[in-house]
């Protein structure tokens, strides 16, 4: 039979006077060692049949006395079987055994849940010698019990290579419920059901759960732990907690905020990091993500020119790194740029629009209709052309660069001329007679030099030749023109 002790039970010492008992109360034993702390034990308990021999593990000594009487079997006396107490209270329990004096060096060890308790435990062994036997009491005390002290404690003693084991003493530390699972913060879709879990344990059991949403109890009657709350959906942020109740009282979980996923806020602080003739590098600060991670962003670009057709170019990019290079833009143009980002719920509004300009670029096309002819009387080559279309100048023309290459008898010489932007003709001096002159022209802006025109060749005869005719840029698909005069 297991004896159970509860707090505030009536004291009922096992033995009168200072003889070994299951609990030290007001009696002072012989040879007792001082306690590590002077607490008052919280527990008293009633033993069953004090002094009855242990029925389990006993050692039968082979030694006999002078009168050849065999010694009785050795066993720990029965003590309390189950001690129930509250957390932080003190407890003291013991094992007692009477050992014939013929045995020397008897030691008692304490074990908890199959492991020997060594080191800094308050274990005290007291000896009460008599003529034939010595009563040994091994006491174990815990000044402030914790849940980790829960378990089954036993005493062991070795005699004659035999091990004597006491009955277990079960220590049950009771306290407020202890959460093993608490609700977690979540981000949820509007009007969509979701679950929260709460689990708490004693002892004492049972543990009952009450759910609280925004300070109102969801269930007015207790639910057994563990409890899963199915929230039928939310339209706005809510705070949830759970209360765990047992006979010792109540523990409240942390409150968790459940947020409703929404479309993100628009990005802010869109700024121009770098501009070139045909691209603009922008960055932005993302807005609030609406409790759902950003998936991607969209950059919207429209020409700011009031005469433009108002079409919007859209560039999609990943949400990170909040940076995008807009390409394929016109040079020296004004643009309005806005950024919008999306999460699983949808797209944000567009950020405030910002104005940005591309820089001047080198022209993207060469001058057109290049014509070259020889003015023999002045010993010059006259060159004429048409300037490239305004749209493709990619800036303000500052002039033209003329490349003229003179080739004669294996000798080649290239010369470059810069001419102003006014007009569309130039005159260069003949450098070599009896040679081919190859002319190419490029438009120039502050952004750089554009592509050169297709080459136009003219043959410069030796002095004295009379006939001449102009040479011009070929029609597409023709071979390089060579005009021999």
């Amino acid at each position: 039979a297991i004896t159970e002790a509860r707090e505030e039970a009536k004291p009922y010492p096992l033995f009168p006077g200072p003889f070994p008992g299951s609990l030290q109360t007001d009696h002072t034993p012989l040879l007792s060692l001082p306690h590590a702390s002077g607490y008052q034990p919280a527990l008293m308990f009633s033993p069953t049949q004090p002094g009855r021999p242990h029925t389990g593990n006993v050692a039968i000594p082979q030694v006999t006395s002078v009168e050849s009487k065999p010694l009785p079997p050795l066993a720990f006396k029965h003590t309390v079987g189950h001690i129930i107490l509250s957390e932080h209270k003190g407890v003291k329990f013991n094992c007692s055994i009477s050992v014939p004096n013929i045995y020397q060096d008897t030691t008692i060890s304490w074990w908890k849940d199959g492991k020997e308790l060594l080191g800094a435990h308050h274990a005290i062994t007291q000896f009460y010698p008599d003529d034939e036997v010595t009563a040994i009491i091994a006491s174990f005390s815990i000044t402030s019990v914790q849940r980790s002290d829960n378990g089954s404690y036993i005493c062991k003693m070795k005699i004659n290579n035999e091990e004597i084991v006491s009955d277990p003493i079960y220590i049950e530390v009771q306290g407020l419920p202890h959460f093993t699972k608490q609700p977690e913060s979540m981000n949820v879709t509007r009007n969509t059901a979701f679950n929260l879990t709460c689990q708490a344990v004693g002892p004492p059991e049972p543990v009952n759960i009450f759910w609280v949403q925004n300070s109102s109890r969801v269930n007015e009657q207790p639910e057994k732990s563990p409890s899963v709350l199915t929230v039928p959906g939310l339209t706005e942020m809510a705070v949830f907690s759970c209360e765990a109740h047992n006979d010792k009282g109540l523990t409240v979980s942390k409150g968790v905020q459940i947020n409703i996923k929404a479309i993100p806020s628009p990005p802010t602080e869109v700024s121009i990091r770098n501009s070139t003739a045909h691209s603009i590098l922008i960055s932005w600060v993302p807005g609030f993500d609406g409790y759902s991670p950003f998936r991607n962003c969209s950059i919207q670009v429209k020409e700011a020119d009031p005469l433009s057709n108002g079409s919007v170019m859209i560039f999609n990019t990943s949400a990170l790194p909040h940076l995008y290079q807009i390409k394929q833009l016109q040079a020296l143009a004004n643009y309005s740029i806005g950024v919008s980002c999306m999460n699983e719920i949808g797209w944000s509004a567009v950020s405030p629009w910002i104005l940005a300009s591309t820089t001047e670029g080198a022209p993207s096309v060469a001058p057109l209709n290049v014509t070259v002819f020889l003015n023999e009387s002045s010993d010059n080559v006259d060159i004429r052309w048409m300037k490239p279309p305004t749209k493709q100048q990619d800036g303000e023309l500052v002039g033209y660069r003329i490349s003229h290459v003179w080739q004669s008898a294996g000798i080649s010489k290239e010369l470059l001329e810069e001419v102003g932007q006014n007009g569309s003709r130039a005159r260069i001096s003949v450098q070599v007679h009896n040679a081919t002159c190859t002319v190419r022209i490029a438009a120039v802006t502050r952004g750089g030099v554009g592509p050169f025109s297709d080459p136009v060749k003219i043959f410069i005869p030796a002095h004295g030749w009379v006939d001449y005719a102009p040479s011009s840029t070929p029609a597409p698909g023709n071979a390089d023109p060579v005009l021999i005069i």
């Epitope: 009007n191 759910w211 949403q213 925004n214 109102s216 969801v218 269930n219 007015e220 009657q221 207790p222 639910e223 709350l229 039928p232 959906g233 939310l234 339209t235 809510a238």
Partner: antibody, heavy 118, light 106 residues
């Protein structure tokens, strides 16, 4: 199947006492609170209060404190509504209802008609 | 305590018509439940927690709302829908009922 069975109609005189029963079946009685709802002839629903079937603790709405008493006989899975010192304005149909989470009344009794007449 | 106002008090509709009744609270609530009651019968659970149809409720019924304004809609009214509909809030104790909207079929 889950149901709440209420006692039959009552005809009482002013000043008398009436006790209405509500017997639950098909579920664990102590898991859900039993609520009482009053409906006067031609009127809407009025929540009177409830009894915690786990602890036995009754809760009364403001207008129903004093002459009204909720009680239980858990072994019979039955809740009771007693009205003392009956008045003419107590003439109504009284419903018991099982309450689940979020104070939703998912099962209702058929109602007990109480007539107060001198 | 929270007061629930249902409007209109009486709603008259022809079969096949779409009708909407509203329930307004004088303070924000988390959920609204709805019950259907026919003369001589006990109320039936109809809508749970704002928008969830109770078992057996026809799909032509829907409900929505948040804060202080909630509504119940019947997309195509049928003769069997004639009843009084009560709303009941969950948000602040005591969890009161509205005064009811009576749906009549012409």
């Amino acid at each position: 199947q889950i149901q709440l069975v209420q006692s039959g109609p009552e005809l009482k005189q002013p000043g008398e006492t009436v006790k209405i029963s509500c017997k639950a079946s098909g579920y664990t009685f102590t898991d859900y609170g039993v609520n009482w709802v009053k409906q006067a002839p031609g009127k809407g629903l009025k929540w009177m209060g409830w009894i915690n079937t786990y602890s036995g603790e009754p809760t009364y709405a403001g207008d129903f404190k004093g002459r009204f008493a909720f009680s239980l006989e858990s072994s019979a899975s039955t809740a009771f509504l007693q009205i003392n010192n009956l008045k003419n304005e107590d003439m109504a149909t009284y419903f018991c209802a099982r309450r689940v989470r979020y104070w939703y009344f998912d099962v209702w009794g058929a109602g007990t008609s109480v007539t107060v007449s001198s | 305590q929270i007061v629930l106002s249902q409007s209109p008090a009486i709603l008259s509709a022809s079969p096949g018509e779409r009708v909407t009744m509203t329930c307004r609270a004088n303070s924000s609530v988390s959920y609204m439940h709805w019950y259907q009651q026919k003369p001589g019968s006990s109320p039936k659970p109809w809508i749970y927690a704002t928008s969830n149809l109770a078992s057996g409720v026809p799909a032509r019924f829907s409900a929505s709302g948040s804060g202080t304004s909630y509504s119940l809609t019947v997309s195509r009214v049928e003769a069997e829908d004639a009843a009084t509909y009560y709303c009941q809030q969950w948000g602040s104790n005591p969890f009161t009922f509205g005064s009811g909207t009576k749906l009549e079929i012409k």
